[in-house]
């Protein structure tokens, strides 16, 4: 007895598609061995039509695929554009065709529905609209028009021209009589239900001279599209429900046990807590289509998803729907990276972002997920030298360590930086990942002065105190700019006296600026790293002013508590464009970033002269890029 299992019989009609699932014991050997689909010949052989090793017969070219789902112990054969020639006996199996590890499947493809016995066949998707056309002769132009549904042996009145509507159709049916020139009436049924399927009879007149027309209504439940994505990766559901529901609330739900379909997200503002921080519902187009992006895929995200339209923002009978079966591949190509990164207020975080290593030249982005309305993710920084104005001096995207990972450093952390951030590129959209930054209590490890003023033409020395826990790390100073942080020479001044209970391994490392010029004004970071992996950083803003008295400046930690410079921005401040990922397609087909003016970007985008508590130091008070 073969351990392979599947459908013994598959019945379909010409033009349709089938998805045949074959089940196998998910042992390590079985998971990785060849999977095949073959057609049994009259003489007992079995000719391979498609296999998991890439072979596709010319008979199946462009209309079939075979997908293995190793963690489920299944593989699926999809065959489209069926014809009666596809009818026959097949095997799905593992290993070699003749070995016997297989299951017999009978596929029967019958002729598609047509005009049989003067019956017009209407094939319509669940939730959509059908128009049943009913011709009549001149002598019945003034007589009663009606539509009946055959229930068992009896016709039941559905609607008529005198105003009757069967209660099962209330609010979703109408009878239209065309202008006098056309001898035709139509019955339009909206929000089609599966129970609407069946035989209908339309009639003009009630006597023996009445005109009758038969109609066969077939209501199709959408076939779930199989979607196979990697653990920790991203999925996009594109939902096109048609222009007739363009103004109706949209939803994406996930089928749980029973008839429940739990709302994942909808356009009425509902969002399931499990998807907080990792979902965007893209604003819909004029034609009613929309898309939903989910990042940071988890094992438990697997399942059947439905998108639809209904005024309640959730699945109801008669909702037009589209369906997907999402499988989450645990043998993921996307490496593990922390989903939560904790940082101390006033200190920093270094986030590692994975990307497809085949796309090393792609543009890298980092954005902040915002939950308002349907979710959006305004860009904060990219790898081409753009940084959102409010983050100048405290945010940097580095291509290091490379080979499939880039680094984002955010310092001068405040409680307002807590939230969800997305790593993404303009390449492979499946590689969008999510990280949550949590702000915790504590003291920054690195100690630097809070506010430094240098004098033109003089020498400035800025200290950075490293505790002994960083004794094995490389210590550096760098000057921040939009494209990164350029390393500067620094001097090790020996052990630091800034730490209690810290031995000789603590270090004071100074940055020296000789003959200060206007160009030296800006943000400077001191930090630690190990090879290409970055650790904590601390930021200092150096302002440059005219000479008042001769001499050099040596800044000590005593000045670290000085109040932030309260200089208000001059009116010539250049407004930088706010870039927001509002349309996930921009990272799929168009490979571009949406630029929208920074008008109503909320509190983060507002340029104020608020306290250092709000935005982390004085990063917003010194815009030196006029």
């Amino acid at each position: 007895k073969s351990p392979i299992f599947g459908p013994e019989e598959v019945n379909s009609v010409e033009g349709n598609s089938v998805s045949i699932t074959c089940y196998y014991p998910p042992t390590s050997v079985n998971r990785h061995t060849r999977k095949y689909w073959c057609r049994q010949g009259a003489r007992g052989g079995c000719i391979t039509l498609i296999s998991s090793e890439g072979y596709v017969s010319s008979k199946y070219a462009g209309r079939a695929n075979l997908t293995n789902f190793p963690e489920n112990g299944t593989f699926v054969v999809n065959i489209a554009q069926l014809s009666q020639d596809d009818s026959g006996r097949y095997k799905c199996g593992l290993g070699i065709n003749s070995r016997g590890l297989s299951f017999d499947v009978s596929l029967e493809v019958s002729q598609g529905p047509g005009l049989l016995n003067d019956t017009k066949v209407y094939t319509v998707d669940l939730g959509r609209t059908v128009t049943i056309n009913c011709p009549f002769k001149t002598e019945n132009a003034q007589k009663r028009k009606s539509l009946y549904k055959q229930i068992g042996l009896y016709p039941v009145l559905v609607i008529d021209s005198s105003g009757y509507v069967n209660p099962n159709y209330t609010g979703r049916i109408r009878l239209d009589i065309q202008g006098t020139g056309q001898l035709l009436f139509s019955v339009v049924i909206n929000q089609l239900r599966l129970s609407d399927a069946g035989q209908y009879l339309c009639q003009a007149g009630d006597d023996s001279n009445s005109n009758k027309k038969n109609a066969d209504l077939q209501v199709l439940k959408p076939e779930p599209e199989l979607v196979y994505e990697d653990l920790r990766g991203s999925v996009t559901f594109h939902c096109a429900l048609g222009p007739e529901v363009a103004n109706v609330a949209k939803f994406l739900c996930r089928q749980s046990s029973g008839e429940n379909c739990d709302v994942v997200v909808n356009t009425l503002g509902k969002r399931a807590p499990a998807f907080e921080g990792r979902i965007l519902l893209n604003p819909q187009d004029k034609d009613g289509s929309f898309s939903v992006v989910i990042t940071g895929l988890r094992k438990e995200d697997a399942g059947r998803y439905l998108c639809g339209a209904h005024s309640d923002g959730q699945l109801q009978e008669g909702s037009p729907i589209q369906a997907w079966q999402l499988f989450v591949n645990e043998e993921s190509t996307i490496p593990r990276s922390p989903t939560v990164v904790k940082g101390v207020a006033g200190s920093s975080v270094a986030v590692l972002c994975p990307y497809n290593r085949k796309e090393s030249k792609s543009i890298k982005y980092w954005c902040l997920w915002e939950g308002a309305q349907n979710g959006r993710c305004p860009l904060l920084v990219d790898s081409e030298g753009w940084v959102k104005a409010q983050y100048e001096g405290r945010l940097s995207l580095l291509e290091e360590p490379g080979n499939g990972t880039f680094t984002v450093i955010l310092n001068q952390l405040t409680s307002r930086d807590a939230g969800f951030y997305w790593c993404l590129t303009n390449g492979d959209t499946l590689w969008r990942t999510t990280v949550e930054i949590k702000i915790i209590e504590g003291e920054p490890n690195l100690k630097v002065p809070g506010n430094v003023t240098a004098v033109l033409g003089e020498t400035l020395k800025v200290p950075c105190h490293f505790p002994c826990k960083f004794s094995s790390y490389e210590k550096y100073w760098c000057k921040w700019n939009n494209t990164g942080c350029q390393a500067l020479p620094s001097q090790d001044e020996g052990p630091s006296k800034a730490f209690v209970n810290c031995d000789e391994n603590s270090r004071l490392v100074s940055l020296t600026l000789n003959l200060v010029t206007r160009a030296d004004e800006g943000w400077y970071w001191c930090g630690v790293k190990q090879g290409h992996f970055y650790g904590e950083t601390a930021a200092v803003y150096v302002a440059v002013e005219e000479r008042k008295a001769a001499g050099s400046r040596d800044v000590s930690l005593a000045k670290a508590d000085a109040a932030p410079d309260e200089k208000v921005l001059d009116s010539g401040f250049r407004e930088i464009e706010n870039k927001a990922i509002q349309d996930p397609r921009l990272f799929a087909e168009e490979k571009a970033v949406a630029d929208t003016r920074d008008q109503a970007d909320g509190s983060r985008a507002s340029v104020d002269s608020g306290s250092s508590e709000e935005q982390g130091g004085s990063s917003r008070h010194h815009h030196h890029h006029h």
Epitope: P7, E8, N11, S12, E223, E259, E317
Partner: nanobody, 126 residues
Framework: QVQLVESGGGLVQAGDSLRLSCAAS????????MGWFRQGPGKEREFVAT??????????YYTDSVKGRFTISRDNAKNTVYLQMNSLKPEDTAVYYC?????????????????WGQGTQVTVSS
């Protein structure tokens, strides 16, 4: 909710035939598959046959012991699934349960079915 009502069970001789019916009512628009399970005296409930559908395509699954003897079918308009049982054997004696599922990843697994009928007794005497 979806309600399932089985009918058609009874007492027959070995080699005879029976046709079981399962009528579904309620929110049947969410179901994707219906099947038959059976529980013989002192035995676990076991998979017999399932039919799943998508549009005008049907997929029929059977357990080995009934292949060639039992046929599962459905009437979409009546929301009813049938199990035609031919060449019945004494070992087919059991309570036959109808089940419906909204999300079916493996038709053989009991826990993938969300709704169950009360069952109908089939007794095959030798």
């Amino acid at each position: 909710q979806v309600q399932l009502v089985e009918s058609g069970g009874g007492l027959v001789q070995a080699g005879d035939s029976l046709r079981l019916s399962c009528a579904a009512s309620g929110r049947t628009f969410t179901t994707y598959g219906m099947g038959w399970f059976r529980q013989g005296p002192g035995k676990e409930r076991e998979f017999v046959a399932t039919i799943t559908w998508s549009g005008s395509t049907n997929y029929k699954y059977y357990t080995d012991s009934v292949k060639g003897r039992f046929t599962i079918s459905r009437d979409n308009a009546k929301n009813t699934v049938y199990l035609q049982m031919n060449s019945l054997k004494p070992e087919d004696t059991a309570v036959y349960y109808c089940a419906a599922s909204t999300v079916l990843t493996d038709p053989r697994r009991l826990n993938e079915y969300d709704y169950w009928g009360q069952g109908t007794q089939v007794t095959v005497s030798s």
